[in-house]
């Protein structure tokens, strides 16, 4: 008995389906036991599904009730399972068993990574710092979603509306501003993109002098 | 015939080391995950460590972890637990257990004792 | 960690008798739940897996039911090499074992 994934890596957008390949072969034509599906996380095994293949009977483990199946070619060597309204939490590597019991090795087992796509949510801009001329201070950019992680970029644009350089790599957050001044004035924006999206967002710096104790 | 035999058990000092040793045979090891229980004398059965066919996956109980430690070598057809710090309460006959279907442990061996006493 | 609770403790039959001993799981555990009869000085022995599937080789007067958080096996007519310990498992969430259920001649 032999399992095999045709791909070690799936991507499927959240929301929808993915089916997580599977094939198995032997020699054996009698189908008495079980397809099963297992997700490999760090503390511990997640049971995802157990089908029988007498009883045509499903055992779920409990996030995937009725959500999950497994292939109509079940016992002609595909044991595939379509997982339906991908979540988040459905992003890992899956194992997948084919146990009969009247081949001499029982048991084999093939592994599948699922990543879950979600595209950025827009991001939220913020200042840290007090905004005030001879000051530093920090622009940050964070989506609170998005799968694979997202890039963060930043881009500056003076009161005249033209692009300037800055003076730090441009790529992750935050943005560093030291010693700001009038010349830092301006609004800056940034992005917050992955493979299957992009979103922005922008804050407005606008330094004003410290205030005087006379 | 499927089979598992430990060895490696005996009395040790408490904070002393021990390895325990699983043998497989008459099935393919490389096949499954294998886990060790333990049951104290007296006592009922307490899972304490699994490990996945490659060695990817490696899941300890609360009660060894940082402790224990499980390795495999699949060329020997050969489980291992190795035992560090040990404690008055580790005190136990440790069982190697073959996982089959949806995580039941289809074969043990015969077990082997471990005692840890001044 | 899921808990299992086993009932009762110890029971007294006699050959023949209907014999029914009960899990309970501290959280849904689907039919993840697995049973082993242990006698003394020996290794436990698989009995059943997934709640009801009987493991090759054992007698079908053992079955076993149940789905979620409750569990029952049953051992329809008890014989005499029957009295040992049972223990339920789920292997839902790693492993936990219930206490036991000690079967003893009446």
């Known amino acids: 008995l032999t399992v095999e994934t045709t791909q070690d890596i799936l991507r499927a957008a959240r929301g929808r389906s993915v089916t997580l390949p599977c094939t198995y072969n032997t020699y054996v034509s009698d189908r008495e036991g079980f397809i099963q599906w297992d997700k490999l996380l760090r503390s511990q095994t997640e049971r995802v599904v157990t089908w029988n293949f007498v009883t045509k009977k499903y055992i779920y483990g409990n996030r995937y009730e009725n959500r999950v199946r497994v292939s109509n070619d079940a016992e002609l060597s595909n044991a595939s399972i379509t997982i339906d309204q991908l979540t988040m939490d459905d992003n890992g590597t899956y194992e997948c068993s084919v146990s009969l019991m009247s081949d001499q090795d029982v048991n084999a087992k093939s592994r599948v990574r699922l990543l879950v796509l979600v595209p950025p949510s827009k991001p939220d801009c913020s200042i840290q710092g007090e905004m005030v001329i001879g000051n530093n201070i920090q622009l940050t950019c964070h989506s609170a979603e998005g799968s694979p992680s997202p890039q963060y970029s930043w881009k500056s644009y003076n009161a005249q509306n033209q692009q300037r350089p800055l003076t730090q790599p441009v790529s992750g957050e935050p943005l560093l501003l030291k010693n700001i001044s009038t010349e830092t004035a301006g609004y800056y924006i940034c992005t917050s993109s992955n493979d299957v999206g992009i979103e922005s967002c922008n804050i407005t710096v606008a330094p004003r002098p410290p205030s005087m104790n006379i | 015939e499927v089979q598992l035999v430990e060895s490696g058990g005996g009395l040790v000092k408490p904070g002393g080391s021990l390895r325990l040793s699983c043998a497989a045979s008459?099935?393919?090891?490389?096949?499954?995950?294998m886990n060790w229980v333990r049951q104290a004398p007296g006592k009922g059965l307490e899972w304490v460590s699994s490990?996945?066919?490659?060695?990817?996956?490696?899941y300890y109980a609360d009660s060894v972890k940082g402790r224990f430690t499980i390795s495999r070598d699949n060329a020997k057809n050969s489980l291992y637990l190795q035992m560090n710090s040990l404690r008055a309460e580790d005190t136990a006959v440790y069982y190697c257990?073959?996982?089959?279907?949806?995580?039941?442990?289809?074969?043990w061996g015969q077990g082997t004792m471990v005692t840890v006493s001044s | 960690a899921i808990q299992l609770t086993q009932s009762p403790s110890s029971l007294s039959a006699s050959v023949g008798d209907r014999v029914t001993i009960t899990c309970r799981a501290s959280?849904?555990?689907?039919?993840?739940l697995n049973w082993y009869q242990q006698k003394p000085g020996k290794a436990p022995k698989l009995l059943i897996y997934i709640a009801s599937s009987l493991q090759s080789g054992v007698p079908s007067r053992f079955s076993g039911s149940g789905s979620g958080t409750d569990f029952t096996l049953t051992i329809s007519s008890l014989q005499p090499e029957d009295f040992a310990t049972y223990y339920c498992q789920q292997s839902y969430n790693t492993w936990t074992f219930g206490q036991g259920t000690k079967v003893e001649i009446k």
């Open positions: 008459g099935f393919t090891f490389s096949s499954y995950s």
């Open positions: 959280q849904s555990i689907s039919s993840y």
């Open positions: 490990i996945s066919r490659d060695s990817t996956y490696i």
């Open positions: 257990a073959r996982e089959g279907v949806a995580g039941a442990f289809d074969i």
